[in-house]
């Protein structure tokens, strides 16, 4: 009876700051009663911990059991299919899940207008699950950078790009009026982490925002 079921074809993590989700793909021809067992291994403690005996979804939030990710050597996870007394072999994540695997995001971007400039303020992520001392800026304490993409509406595909090294930035509009839409993608210069583009924030600039000087 041991291992008649096929194993989940793929298992991987998708993670943002204190939001660590394990994903896997279903076994072929799974039945109504097929579920998935999830186990976790912390590097340095070489034993597998069972996290869920029978998940019927194809993802599992492991944030609560990986809260020390940012102060550890990382984790591996494994998943197997279970159907009654039958189970598959384990499929293990093929990379170590560490701080390097976390996709960087911003919390939000606030825009305002002052004297023909667009002033932007980047709010850093503040996830509820994060321990009080583990702020984004304490974990990524140096070399935070942000790529800024600006789109003027209309003119859907005309992008201007700039890179800034602070959470506050200013964009010169060259006296143009209209709607300006901004997206931000964070990075850390000393790290290889991927960044995710933020939701687009837009602001309208009209003549009233320009100061007339003689």
């Amino acid at each position: 009876h041991g291992t008649e079921l096929p194993s989940p074809p793929s298992v991987w993590f998708e993670a943002e700051f204190f939001h660590h989700i394990l994903h896997w793909t279903p076994i072929p021809n799974q039945s109504e009663s097929t579920c998935y067992e999830v186990a976790l291994l912390r590097y340095g403690i070489e034993s597998w911990n069972s996290i869920s005996n029978c998940s019927q979804t194809l993802s599992y939030d492991l944030t609560a059991v990986t809260l020390d990710l940012y102060h550890s050597n990382g984790y591996r996870a494994r998943v197997r299919a279970v159907d009654g007394s039958r189970h598959s072999n384990w499929t293990v994540t093929n990379t170590r899940f560490s701080v390097d695997e976390v996709t960087l995001t911003v919390g939000s971007v606030n825009l305002e207008i002052h004297n023909g400039f667009i002033l932007g303020k980047i709010q850093l992520p503040r996830p509820k699950m994060a321990p009080a001392n583990d702020t984004y800026e304490s974990i990524f304490s140096h070399f935070r950078e942000y790529e800024i993409a600006i789109r003027k509406v209309p003119g859907n595909f005309t992008f201007t790009h700039k890179k800034v090294k602070h959470e506050n930035f200013s964009l010169l509009t060259s006296g143009e009026v209209g709607e300006f839409c901004v997206q931000v993608k964070p990075s850390v210069a000393s790290r290889s982490n991927k960044g995710m583009w933020s939701k687009e924030e837009c602001i309208s600039l009209t003549r009233q925002y320009f100061t007339v000087t003689n």
Epitope: S10, E14, H20, T25, S59, T103, F159, W197
Partner: nanobody, 124 residues
Framework: QVQLLESGGGLVQAGGSLKLSCTNS????????MGWFRQPPGKEREFVSS????????YYSDSVKGRFALSRDKAKNTVYLQMDSLKPEDTAVYYC?????????????????WGQGTQVTVSS
């Protein structure tokens, strides 16, 4: 900075095939994956298929499993939805979207940067 453009829709007879493409024309793709959703006339938008960008792992709704196949070309920043054995009930506007958070591959809430959509009509 993800700008998605769908193509390949059209009118086809039941039993026929179509191949939809979705290309990111933005400078860089930063999502976890891509998904196709559809909106049949007078109905809600529903999940069709999705793919993880790195591993190429795919998911399908029960209604298209075995008939549709999703693939990706990383070099071209493009995903392809091969639709075979089409049925009249596959008639819909098909939308492509980027997966922008770590949540489920089946939920519209996990996706953003939606394309404009491409019409697929299957006649009987």
């Amino acid at each position: 900075q993800v700008q998605l453009l769908e193509s390949g829709g059209g009118l086809v007879q039941a039993g026929g095939s179509l191949k939809l493409s979705c290309t990111n024309s933005g400078r860089t793709f930063s999502g976890y994956g891509m998904g196709w959703f559809r909106q049949p006339p007078g109905k809600e938008r529903e999940f069709v298929s999705s793919i993880n960008w790195i591993y190429g792992a795919t998911y399908y709704s029960d209604s298209v499993k075995g008939r549709f196949a999703l693939s990706r070309d990383k070099a071209k920043n493009t995903v392809y939805l091969q639709m075979d054995s089409l049925k009249p009930e596959d008639t819909a506007v098909y939308y492509c979207a980027a997966k922008i958070n770590g949540e489920s591959y089946f939920n519209t809430g996990s996706f953003g940067s939606w394309g404009q959509g491409t019409q697929v009509t299957v006649s009987s």
